[in-house]
């Protein structure tokens, strides 16, 4: 059975040129964490694998920082980078929990983080 | 040319065991995961486990825990499937396959398979 | 555990026919894999993550579907098509395919 929740850091703004860190969490499982993918709508940004390591997609390789921890960095953002993000944790033996991140990319310099809020 | 090798079929009494080989050729052993599929006569596909010969670590099917135990030789880039306590449940095909690790391709290779018939 | 179903367990089609072959899951998943098995062989790998085709694949099988509903469809059947087509699923442990679409040439 599934008992996990996922926190992550909610809808975010951030300015033109700047950087994001996108985090998720996992609680509430005594779960193993066997691999987090990062996805930007179905597109493939990164991969975190316990037993393997890192991995970036080789066209955000320029722009996608690993780290930290289970967590991803946005580099040298663009208006194009708004949207939808998910955290895709597969777990053993639960299974596959996701999260999702609002990232709205501002021209101004008035970029405000909001609010935490949980997933289960 | 990417390679599963399996080793050949095994006629083995009930109540013994049996340890099957799975002998990796074209890619780095420690770059993928193995995973073990059982195929019973004119039945589908059943998964055993996954297995990192890097580390060791093993996800396996609660059903087989204390049924198979894998091990790999990186050495040889071999991995090997232990069958214990044979019954006649336990006549099958089974195959070893490498997964894609970033989850893009599911098992992407596999051995040839290597037939157990349990018998007195 | 995620229990996928497969419908029809047996189907036979002639060539130039449309086939669709569905896997329904028991719980929603992420994605789909699917996989071609003919007798004596070892599976192949036939279509990951839903919708696209493994190496070698023809282009007129095509994969879609999301949550608890999947399927893999050849849009003209052609002789070489004849196999058991398998789902799979990655979204939980443990690992499960479904039991199988035996498809056979009319």
């Known amino acids: 059975m599934m008992t996990g929740t996922i926190e992550t850091t909610g809808n975010i703004s951030a300015e033109k040129g700047g950087s994001i860190i996108l985090q998720c969490h996992l609680s509430s499982t005594t779960a193993q964490v066997t691999q987090v993918n990062w996805e930007q709508q179905d597109q493939l940004l990164a991969i975190c694998n316990a037993d393997l390591g890192w991995h970036i997609s080789p066209s955000f390789k320029d722009r996608v920082a690993p780290g930290p921890g289970l967590g991803l960095t946005l580099q040298s953002l663009t208006v194009n980078d708004t949207g939808e993000y998910f955290c895709i944790y597969h777990t053993y033996p639960d299974g596959t929990y996701t999260g999702r991140i609002f990232l709205e990319v501002l021209e101004s310099s008035v970029a405000e983080h909001g609010a935490r809020f949980q997933i289960p | 040319d990417i390679q599963l090798k399996q080793s050949g079929a095994e006629l083995v009494r009930p109540g013994a065991s049996v340890k099957l080989s799975c002998k990796a050729s074209?890619?780095?052993?420690?770059?993928?995961?193995i995973n073990w599929v059982k195929q019973r006569p004119g039945q589908g596909l059943e998964w055993i486990a996954r297995?990192?010969?890097?580390?060791?670590?093993?996800y396996y099917n609660e059903k087989f825990k204390g049924k198979a135990t894998l091990t790999a030789e990186k050495s040889s880039s071999t991995a090997y499937m232990q069958l214990s306590s044979l019954t006649s449940e336990d006549s099958a095909v089974y195959f070893c396959?490498?997964?894609?690790?970033?989850?893009?391709?599911?098992?992407?290779?596999w051995g040839q398979g290597t037939t157990v018939t349990v018998s007195s | 555990d995620i229990v996928l179903t497969q419908s029809p367990a047996i189907m036979s089609a002639s060539p130039g026919e449309k086939v669709t072959i569905s896997c329904s899951a028991n719980?929603?998943?992420?994605?789909m894999y699917w996989y071609q098995q003919k007798p004596g062989s070892s599976p192949k790998p036939w279509i990951y993550?839903?919708?696209n085709l493994a190496s070698g694949v023809p282009a007129r099988f095509s994969g879609s579907g999301s949550g608890t509903s999947y399927s893999l469809t050849i849009s003209s059947m052609e002789a070489e098509d004849a196999a058991t087509y398998y789902c799979?699923?990655?979204?939980?442990?443990?690992?499960?395919f479904g039991a199988g679409t035996k498809l056979e040439l009319k």
């Open positions: 799979q699923q990655y979204h939980s442990y443990p690992l499960t």
């Open positions: 993550r839903t919708s």
């Open positions: 396959a490498r997964e894609a690790w970033l989850l893009f391709y599911g098992m992407d290779y």
């Open positions: 297995f990192y010969p890097g580390s060791g670590n093993t």
């Open positions: 074209g890619y780095t052993f420690t770059d993928s995961y």
């Open positions: 719980s929603s998943v992420s994605y």
